[in-house]
């Protein structure tokens, strides 16, 4: 496929990545699917600098990111290693609160109103951020 060299319309370029910030709210799985359909993924935060960039754009509203532990350990949706990577949890989070009886605790991570991270029930209707990398081969077939 051809390489993406500039961001799509209504996406914001930052450090060789493109970001799209939702205004509406969706459950985590619906948000994840939305990003995939855009040939992107829920945002993966790899540095304090990227954290600050995203925080500036989302404001004080709970916002899903591409981090979950629905299959056990915490995982980033793009395969970035969680254990060795950047983290910005609120104090005493993630707490994986099991009281809701959904069977898996609080399995999805979101930015809170102060930007720090919390884990919550994945069905909550929060905003979300999609990210795609520039110079990444797109899924479109090359022009003949």
């Amino acid at each position: 496929g051809s390489e993406r060299t500039c961001c799509p319309v209504n996406w914001v370029e930052h450090e060789r990545s493109c970001y799209w910030f939702s205004r509406s709210g969706k459950a985590w799985a619906d948000a994840d699917n939305y990003c995939r359909l855009e040939d992107a993924h829920l945002v993966v935060v790899t540095s304090w600098e990227e954290q600050k960039f995203v925080q500036r754009h989302i404001g004080p509203v709970n916002t899903w990111m591409g981090l979950h532990d629905q299959n056990g350990p915490w995982k980033w949706v793009d395969g970035t290693d969680y254990e060795t990577g950047f983290k910005n949890w609120r104090p005493e989070q993630p707490d994986d609160w099991y009281g809701h009886g959904l069977g898996g605790g609080e399995d999805c991570a979101h930015f809170t109103d102060d930007g720090r991270w919390n884990d919550d029930v994945c069905q909550r209707p929060y905003r979300w951020v999609c990210e795609t990398e520039l110079d990444k081969a797109s899924q479109e077939p090359p022009l003949l």
Epitope: R23, G25, P60, H100, V121, Q123, R124
Partner: antibody, heavy 120, light 107 residues
Framework: QVQLVESGGGVVQPGRSLRLSCAAS????????MHWVRQAPGKGLEWVAV????????NYADSVKGRFTISRDNSKNTLYLQMNSLRAEDTAVYYC?????????????WGQGTTVTVSS | DIQMTQSPSSLSASVGDRVTITCRTS??????LAWFQQKPGKAPKSLLY???SLQSGVPSKFSGSGSGTDFTLTISSLQPEDFATYYC?????????FGGGTKVEIK
């Protein structure tokens, strides 16, 4: 003190339209999500719609989807519910209620309600 | 949609009694459960949110508990002003849904 005052209710024929208003005071209106909830005579509470603090997100009950529109004017501290194609089953007391946060944190403050009667 | 089932639908109690109302949800709702009190001809009043957190100004005789799909509202010592209808509500996701209500009457 925090106050919500609904207006615009009345008697209307089936198929006609009505617009409800909710005037807010005593808090920073533009920081809070707002909801409409209704109660048919002698029945329980039914959630109708929500609009987030900045108007960016709106959700509706299936029973009113496509007929009712929730909106807000933050400069006027006012919430609205435009009700079209009214049916007899829309007869109810309509309450506006403040969300505890931007729109997904539950209800805390309620207005006194305005009565809508749909009858021919 | 998430279904909310309250029980009992009505109960008779005396002043000073301890009253318990239950709310069962059709699926887990996290901690996103609220309780409301409504008196005839009046607007609902918020009592509790996030299962057990008291709204400002609500007396501590009201308490909430539960997890998973089963939740409870308890009034520790019923007073004359507590005779009303009580509703539970989930706000985990849209559409928000209410229980059918429990009417607390004087015995």
């Amino acid at each position: 003190q925090v106050q919500l005052v609904e207006s615009g209710g009345g008697v209307v024929q089936p198929g006609r339209s009505l617009r409800l208003s909710c005037a807010a005071s005593g808090f920073t209106f533009s920081s809070y999500g707002m909801h409409w909830v209704r109660q048919a005579p002698g029945k329980g509470l039914e959630w109708v719609a929500v609009i987030w603090y900045d108007g960016s997100n709106k959700n509706y009950a299936d029973s009113v989807k496509g007929r009712f529109t929730i909106s807000r004017d933050n400069s006027k501290n006012t919430l609205y519910l435009q009700m079209n194609s009214l049916r007899a089953e829309d007869t109810a007391v309509y309450y506006c209620a403040r969300d505890q946060g931007v729109g997904y944190d539950g209800l805390d403050v309620w207005g006194q309600g305005t009565t809508v009667t749909v009858s021919s | 949609d998430i279904q909310m089932t309250q029980s009992p639908s009505s109960l008779s109690a005396s002043v000073g009694d301890r009253v318990t109302i239950t709310c069962r949800t059709s699926q887990g709702i996290g901690k996103y459960l609220a309780w409301f009190q409504q008196k005839p001809g009046k607007a609902p009043k918020s009592l509790l949110y996030k299962v057990s957190s008291l709204q400002s100004g609500v007396p501590s005789k009201f308490s909430g508990s539960g997890s998973g799909t089963d939740f409870t509202l308890t009034i520790s010592s019923l007073q004359p002003e507590d005779f009303a209808t009580y509703y539970c509500q989930q706000y985990m996701t849209y559409p928000l849904t209410f229980g059918g209500g429990t009417k607390v009457e004087i015995k």
